[in-house]
């Protein structure tokens, strides 16, 4: 960065003005030193200056006043295109009894420190030495418009050069682009688009599909107001200026419709009176989704053909669903909505529930004493079917048996065919209490209520029964 | 627009290995199952396989231990992996996008409802 | 594995004809309907035309039809257009099992 390079010249439209797009007429070399005072931009002596200046205390041996540091007049407005180059500098003449004087450049109030392309140079006389400062830029960006000056501290006291603005003009840069959005049919909704230069004025054109929606150009910023669309639209917008035109980026508008069935379901676990299912949504047609139908009906062809429904949120896309018979077969479908409202059901699907303990106990135990044959018998009726939870295996009867200062529990596997059984008797002069429960592959069901009977003594006689009632029959 | 674009497909010595490749445009592999179907030359379609959502496999029997199907959802493309591969296994592979999966977790298998969209195919020829 | 066979395995027709393609399965479809029908047309892949035994896929036109349920199928072209030449493939699935199995194809052409 420190070779010189010729930077164009122009004059520009109004006094103090550069316009930098043409003819390079003068360069600064990068080198301190005497150099023939080559001025980037014209002095202008005899103009009274506006910016700070510094009275200096000391005098000369012979005690005359020093006249008052200055910045000389330059160049107040620069005005290029994007990514061209640009050089400007301030100048100052210093009494030589001045040592170590430094020059600053600031942007906006900020000192500019770092890897800036600025030069000083010095170039001494008998009295004074002419120093220039020189800033320069290889490819201006809209970053680097602003207003620049030089600062200069001598003897505690600050000299202000006046300032310099940058104007970097080029092709429109959005500040605000239109959006893509979601839309109701047939809703009206705004986009925006703002652009700015320099050069202004900005004026956009919006277009939609490919065509200019509006005829006649608007200042930016603009508001488009779209009444309503029935179909998919891509919008744009131009924003044109003195230098050019530049595209926003197309953005898609989309109608919100009723989503789409969802892609997978999957059965996760199946017990005797519940399925979990989870799913995966379908598309969402552009409005997010609300909640999740589950429908389920029995698959047996006789059962009447009645629909459970569950509702559940739509996330995390898992439901059980419960209060399901065992063993039975289910067809289950999911329906999913959102603003718009409900997809299609998916495809059904086949489910069962499993196997399960019965639920309730056998009916109508009743106990009587065979005493000729030293046995208890017990009778009792099957749980109904719908609460079997299964296919029935068999029962398990508890016997207690209890007299003084005895209590004996003892358990008995029977088969599933029919509904009685006999026991030995295990103490006499006791209380024998009987409680049944049906067993299947899912497991062994509630006991019933216990029936007691009493075992006499040898030689006693009491042949009437014990039972437990049948619902309803209390 | 909704796509799949087959490629991999070559000629191929018996007993080589090759993958191919299905990219998914216009919908995500993390919302849909996704199935392979060869044909070969003047024959009908067979059933490969296919990766759910999840990324479950579940393949045809004549084709396990040979045959893998995965998928990178990041960028949003199946493969299917061909091992010692035999001149029988000459086709046109398609992938096809599957309209509705139902996955059976518990007993490891799953049903395809329907295959709703399908690639222009590429074909594998093994030969030596 | 179940098997699926279609028949006839050639058939040939005129433009205007009413045609009909059977599919029967060794064992029942899942669901009882969760039988597809495919067109495929030479050097193209195959294009999904009914599900579910007899929805219409999006875009078909109206003059195909399908039935039945189980292990019986039907596609039927209730007036074949120069556009319906081509092979035509039924496939399903099948309960306690992963296979998606396609029928052997039917061939319509000109007669």
């Known amino acids: 960065r420190e070779e010189a390079k010729p930077y164009p010249l122009f004059p520009g439209p109004f006094p103090g003005s550069l316009q930098t797009d043409h003819t390079p007429l003068l360069s600064l070399p990068h080198a301190s030193g005497y150099q023939p005072a080559l001025m980037f931009s014209p002095t202008q002596p005899g103009r009274p200056h506006t910016g700070n200046v510094a009275i200096p205390q000391v005098t000369s041996v012979e005690s005359k006043p020093l006249p008052p540091l200055a910045f000389k007049h330059t160049v107040g407005h620069i005005i290029l295109s994007e990514h061209k180059g640009v050089k400007f500098n301030c100048s100052i003449s210093v009494p030589n009894i001045y040592q170590d004087t430094t020059i600053s450049w600031w942007k906006d109030g900020k000192e500019l420190l770092g890897a800036h392309h600025a030069i000083t140079q010095f170039y001494p006389d008998d009295e004074v030495t002419a120093i220039i400062a020189s800033f320069s830029i290889t490819s201006v960006q809209r970053s680097d418009n602003g207003s620049y000056i030089c600062k200069m501290k001598i003897n505690n006291e600050e000299i202000v050069s006046d300032p310099i603005y940058i104007e970097v003009q080029g092709l429109p840069h959005f500040t605000k682009q239109p959006e893509s959005m979601n839309v109701t049919r047939n809703t009206a909704f705004n986009l925006t688009c703002q652009a700015v230069g320099p050069p202004e004025p900005v004026n956009i054109f919006w277009v939609q599909n490919s065509s200019r929606v509006n005829e006649q150009p608007e200042k930016s910023p603009s508001v488009l107001t779209v009444p309503g669309l029935t179909e998919m639209a891509v919008f744009s917008c131009e924003a044109h200026n003195d230098k050019g035109l530049t595209v926003s980026k197309g953005v898609q508008i989309n109608i919100k419709a009723i989503p789409s069935p969802p892609t997978e379901v999957s059965i996760r676990n199946s017990t005797a009176h519940s399925i979990l299912i989870s799913w995966v949504p379908g598309f969402d047609g552009y409005s997010p989704f609300r909640n999740c139908s589950i429908q389920v009906k029995e698959a047996d062809p006789l059962s009447n053909g009645s629909v459970m429904i569950f509702n559940t949120s739509a996330l995390p896309h898992l439901y059980q669903i419960k209060q399901l018979q065992a063993l039975a077969n289910y067809s289950i479908g999911v329906s999913c909505m959102n603003e718009i409202g409900w997809s299609a059901v998916s495809p059904w699907i086949l489910a069962s529930t499993t196997e399960g303990a019965p639920s309730v106990a056998p009916l109508n135990v009743t106990v009587f004493l065979n005493e000729s044959s030293d046995n208890v018998d017990i009778r009792w009726m099957k749980p109904p079917t719908k609460q079997q939870d299964g296919e029935l295996v068999g029962y398990r009867i508890s016997h207690v048996w209890q007299s003084a200062g005895i209590s004996k529990e003892l358990l008995e596997e029977v088969g599933q065919n029919g509904s009685r059984a006999r026991i030995s008797v295990q103490v006499h002069n006791a209380t024998c209490t009987v409680r049944i429960a049906a067993v299947t592959r899912g497991g062994v069901g509630p006991f019933s209520d216990p029936v007691k009977i009493f075992i006499p003594a040898h030689g006693w006689v009491d042949y009437a029964p014990s039972s437990t009632p049948a619902p309803g029959n209390a | 627009e909704q796509q799949l674009v087959e490629s991999g497909g070559g000629l191929i010595q018996p007993g080589g290995s090759l993958r191919l490749s299905c990219a998914v445009s216009?919908?995500?592999?993390?919302?849909?199952?996704m199935s392979w179907v060869r044909q070969a030359p003047g024959k009908g379609l067979e059933w490969i396989g296919i990766i759910s959502s999840s990324g479950s496999t579940y393949s045809a029997s004549w084709a396990k231990g040979r045959f893998t199907i995965s998928k990178d959802s990041s960028k949003n493309t199946m493969y299917l992996q061909m091992n010692s591969l035999r001149a029988e296994d000459t086709a046109v592979y398609f992938c096809a996008r599957v309209g509705f999966f139902v996955g059976y977790g518990a007993y490891d298998y799953g049903i395809i409802h329907r295959l709703d969209l399908w690639g222009q195919g590429t074909l594998v020829t093994v030969s030596s | 594995d179940a098997q699926m066979t279609q028949s006839p395995s050639t058939l040939s027709a005129s433009v205007g004809d009413r045609v009909t393609i059977t599919c029967q399965s060794s064992?029942?479809?899942?669901?009882?309907?969760?039988l597809s029908w495919y067109q495929q047309k030479p050097g193209k892949p195959p294009k999904l035309l009914i599900y579910?035994?007899?929805d219409l896929a999006s875009g078909v036109p109206s003059r195909f039809s399908g039935s039945g349920s189980g292990t019986e199928f039907t596609l039927t072209i209730s007036s074949l257009q120069p556009d319906d030449f081509a092979t035509y493939y039924c496939?399903?699935?099948?309960?306690?099992?992963?296979?998606?199995?396609f029928g052997g194809g039917t061939k319509v052409e000109i007669k």
């Open positions: 064992k029942s479809i899942y669901n009882n309907n969760w």
């Open positions: 496939a399903g699935g099948y309960s306690g099992d992963s296979d998606y199995a």
């Open positions: 216009g919908f995500s592999l993390s919302s849909n199952a």
């Open positions: 579910d035994a007899s």
